[in-house]
């Protein structure tokens, strides 16, 4: 209620001699600070000085005096909240009540503390869980209700005497719910645990001991068996008898069935401790184990490999793989039942032995078409020789051979013809299903395995065909040589290497880039006229007269092309230059008189130089010099200069006459 | 060096006379090897050749389209100068005149001695 | 009578630019082209003729070059004092023309 102090802290404390306590503990007081603390040993109250008696331990008042016993006790609270409290050493006597006297300026209370301190240090306890199975983990708990700042301890694990080598996880707690040092360590007993010792050991903290508590594993698993045959190598032929022992060694709890398997297949009406099997076949060979259970579960015996031995049975053979491709590896496989295994085989192909083929698998690395046919073999061990089966079927596939490429035509085929082309082959496995054709192009398949080229191009050269199975067997490509008229004739100008200039030698060139058959006849024309029949034109000196537009012809046997018109440009300086005058040579004075330079240059004139009866230039560089107003003066010879990039031309002299008007006549 | 010295009113009323004279120093207005030329600038028309005069066997002018009929060219080689006269004036005609030599040789006919320019205004 | 356009009509470079100027004339003048330089209050003067001939006394940065109806003005590597109007001319046939003119004005 509000009427009193607040106090939180263990119960009782537990230590022994010589280690120490540690009380942690925490308060309230009623109204303000506290002002006085005394810890009692055992205190009693006194009706009479309404006081308590009882050892002094520790105290603390506003005068500051402290009693020698201090050093041992200390308070380790404050005016507040704390009042934890350190005994360190702790002694034998110090077990009983110890009380706590507090006091505020107007408040007053005594809280107790059960302390317990054993003359000897008191042993952990380990905690185990309810039940513990085989190869199941567990944690064993081993606490201690003590733990104390002063006094370090340590907890250690030991399975029959030895410390265990798992890692264990070591815990304290000191706070005022609970004081204790505990160690939990994880554990998969197995069945070989059961009964053991496991002992938790209190040591200080150089390792020596203090203390222990120890348990005795109860670990509950299936039984543990042992088989013994006879006999012992498990090993006998048909009609012997065989006799199995199943001994168990360990069961927790006991067992509770017996049963035998073979091939992990439950065997009906064997439910005793021996198995009997009398004149054995070799169905029966197999692994026999014997199974015996109990409430945690069945446990199983290791197995035994009980072998009967027989003769061959007849065989078959495992072909890899079939079909096969020519060229590609083959491994042939004799099955046959047989104890102990067959030591010797015999192979036939088509009902022949093949010679030198002893062993249970026959290996061809590289396969050709006569290795097809039926495979069969026969197997023997020391009990016998086995039947011969009935063998198995290898079928050696490969592509179509000796393809060929085969013209029917008459020869020579010429540019735009029909040609029809057929595909042979001597032999294929499997059967030849379609046929490819190289070059492609947009030709007709009238057939299987025939080819018609409708108007045969001139560049159609050669063609090739492949048969076709799974594989595509190509032929050699087979040359149609295709007879054509000359082809891309064209005129070529040999020299001058630059632009044709008037007096250059000059020489054209007709090229054809190909002709099938190659004799060839040329021919040149120019406007229709016939100039040559020669593979160049030369011309020793040209002349502006012998521009103009150029083609060749080249024919063969089958027909003849004609060149685009080439034209010829001969550059020259302007000539036949004249000046003519406008309105006329005579102009009254004050009218208009335009002058005109006319030639004849190829490039055209750039610029024109006029010049006066002088030889003085006019500065004009234009066709045309206009005059005006005219004078009388200007009557004259007048010549003009033309230029281009070849050179220059001049004119002859042209004579401007300017007379007087009618006006400049009457004013005289 | 030659150099051009031109003179002349810098105001005209419209309807009036310009005149002009550029002044030659180091060259002859008759010599055969140049062109006596007038230009002149304005904001609008930017650079305009009005014509030229110049001595070969005989004087020649050219004018401009843009003037005919309105302007004379007269070259006085006595004083050896020459003249420009543009009748009926504008404030279109309004402009900075300009006389050049315009080299006959090596160079082309082009400009390669100015005058310092007259501001002409026509108001 | 021939038309000369000038590209571009104006430009802003810094010193030490390349510069270039194009004239086309609308028909072949030949070699007839010659290029002026005007500043401000002062009279045309003349820095290229005959296309590509540079005229005394002008510094060799600037050059011409050309035929027929496309011309060039390259001035290599601008200075302060190329900052003004340019201008081409012909002197082909009558009546002589120039270009509107190209301002080149700092960047």
């Known amino acids: 209620d509000s009427s009193k102090w607040v106090f939180e802290h263990p119960e009782t404390l537990y230590a022994w001699e010589g280690a120490c306590v540690w009380i942690p503990c925490t308060y309230r007081a009623l109204d303000g600070d506290l002002e006085s603390f005394i810890l009692f040993h055992n205190p009693e109250y006194n009706k009479n000085t309404s006081k308590f008696d009882g050892t002094r331990l520790y105290e603390s008042t506003k005068d500051g005096k402290v009693p020698s016993e201090q050093k041992r006790v200390q308070f380790l609270g404050d005016k507040n909240k704390n009042c934890t409290l350190s005994i360190h050493p702790v002694h034998l006597n110090d077990s009983g009540q110890l009380g706590l006297r507090m006091e505020s300026k107007t408040e007053k209370w005594m809280e107790r503390i059960h302390l317990n301190v054993s003359e000897r240090p008191f042993p952990p306890h380990i905690q185990l869980p309810p039940e513990i199975q085989e190869s199941q983990e567990v944690t064993l708990t081993c606490l201690l209700n003590f733990s104390c700042y002063g006094y370090p301890i340590q907890l250690q694990w030991l399975l029959e005497g030895v410390p265990m080598r798992q890692a264990a996880v070591t815990s304290t707690s000191l706070t005022i719910k609970s004081v204790f040092t505990r160690s939990e360590l994880k554990f998969s007993p197995q069945w070989s645990h059961h009964g053991k010792i496991v002992t938790c050991q209190l040591q200080d903290a150089d390792g020596k001991f203090l203390s222990n508590d120890t348990v005795q594993l109860n670990v509950k698993h299936t039984p543990k068996l042992e088989i013994k045959v006879t006999p012992s190598d498990a090993i006998v032929r048909e009609g012997d008898s065989v006799t199995m022992t199943c001994e168990v060694s360990s069961s927790n709890p006991e067992y509770t069935t017996v049963s035998w398997l073979k091939d992990g297949t439950s065997l009906k009406k064997q439910n005793t401790f021996t198995l009997n099997l009398r004149e054995v076949t070799k169905d029966q060979s197999g692994k026999y184990c014997c199974q015996v259970s109990n409430d945690v579960g069945p446990g199983r015996s290791e197995e035994v490999f009980l072998q009967v031995q027989y003769a061959p049975e007849p065989s078959t053979v495992q072909i890899l793989h079939s079909p096969a491709v020519e060229g590609s590896q083959v491994e042939f496989l004799c099955m046959s039942l047989a104890n102990p295994l067959p030591t010797n085989y015999t192979w036939y192909h088509n009902g022949k032995e093949m010679q030198g083929r002893t062993e249970e698998k026959v290996h061809i690395p590289k396969i050709l078409p006569w290795h097809a046919g039926t495979y069969s073999c026969v197997a023997e061990n020391i009990l016998g020789t086995g039947q011969r089966g009935p063998g198995a079927e290898l079928d050696v596939q490969y592509p179509p051979k000796k393809v060929t490429t085969v013209i029917q035509n008459p020869m020579p085929i010429r540019e735009g013809d029909t040609v029809t082309l057929s595909c042979n082959y001597n032999s294929s496995n499997p059967s030849v299903t379609r046929y490819e054709w190289k070059p492609h192009g947009a030709w007709e398949e009238p057939s299987l395995g025939v080819l018609k080229i409708q108007n045969v191009g001139w560049d159609n050269t050669t063609i090739a065909c492949a048969a076709c199975n799974s594989w595509c067997s190509w032929a050699s490509p087979v040359a149609l040589n295709v007879q054509y008229a000359p082809r891309d004739v064209r005129v070529r100008k040999i020299k001058p290497l630059s632009e044709i200039h008037s007096g250059n030698s000059v020489s054209l060139q007709c090229d054809f880039s190909s002709s099938h058959p190659k004799e060839v006849q040329f021919f040149w024309e120019k406007n229709g006229r016939l100039l040559g029949k020669e593979s160049q034109l030369n011309f020793d000196s040209i002349s502006p007269e012998d521009a103009g537009s150029y083609s060749c012809w080249v024919n063969n046997s089958i027909g003849q092309t004609a060149s685009k018109a080439w034209t010829l440009e001969v550059l020259y300086a302007p000539r036949r230059l004249r000046v003519s005058m406008s309105p006329g040579d005579q102009v009254m004075e004050g009218k208009s008189a335009t002058l005109t330079c006319e030639s004849d240059a190829n490039p055209p004139v750039s610029h024109y130089t006029w010049f006066d009866w002088n030889n003085q230039s006019l500065p004009y560089h234009s066709q045309k010099l206009r005059l005006e107003p005219v004078k009388v003066q200007h009557s004259g010879a007048y010549w003009c200069q033309g230029t281009n990039s070849v050179g220059k031309g001049r004119s002859p002299l042209s004579t401007l006459t300017v007379y007087y008007s009618p006006e400049t006549i009457g004013r005289r | 060096q030659v150099q051009l010295q031109q003179s002349g009113p810098g105001l005209v009323k419209p309807s009036q006379t310009l005149s002009l004279t550029c002044a030659i120093s180091g060259d002859s207005v008759s010599g055969n090897r140049a062109t006596w030329n007038w230009i002149r600038q304005s904001p609008s028309r930017g650079l305009e050749w009005l014509g030229r005069?110049?001595?070969?066997?005989?004087?020649?002018?050219d004018y401009a389209v843009s003037v005919k009929g309105r302007i004379t060219f007269n070259p006085d080689t006595s004083k050896n100068q020459f003249s420009l006269q543009l009748n009926s004036v504008t404030p279109e005609d309004t402009a900075v005149y300009y006389c050049a030599r315009g080299e006959s040789g090596a160079a082309a006919d082009a400009f390669d001695i100015w005058g310092q320019g007259t501001t002409v205004t026509v108001s | 009578d021939i038309q000369l356009t000038q590209s571009p009509p104006s430009l802003s470079a810094s010193v030490g630019d390349r510069v270039t100027i194009t004239c086309r004339a609308s028909?072949?003048?030949?070699?007839?082209l010659n290029w002026y330089q005007q500043k401000p209050g002062k009279a045309p003067k003349l820095l290229i003729y005959?296309?590509?001939s540079l005229q005394s006394g002008v510094p060799s940065r600037f050059s011409g070059s050309g035929f027929g109806t496309d011309f060039t003005l390259t001035i290599s590597s601008l200075q302060p004092e190329d900052f003004a109007t340019y201008y081409c001319?012909?002197?082909?046939?009558?009546?002589?023309?120039f270009g509107q003119g190209t301002k080149v004005d700092i960047k």
């Open positions: 005959a296309a590509s």
């Open positions: 005069t110049y001595y070969r066997s005989a004087w020649y002018n």
């Open positions: 001319q012909q002197s082909y046939s009558t009546p002589q023309t």
């Open positions: 028909q072949s003048i030949s070699s007839y």
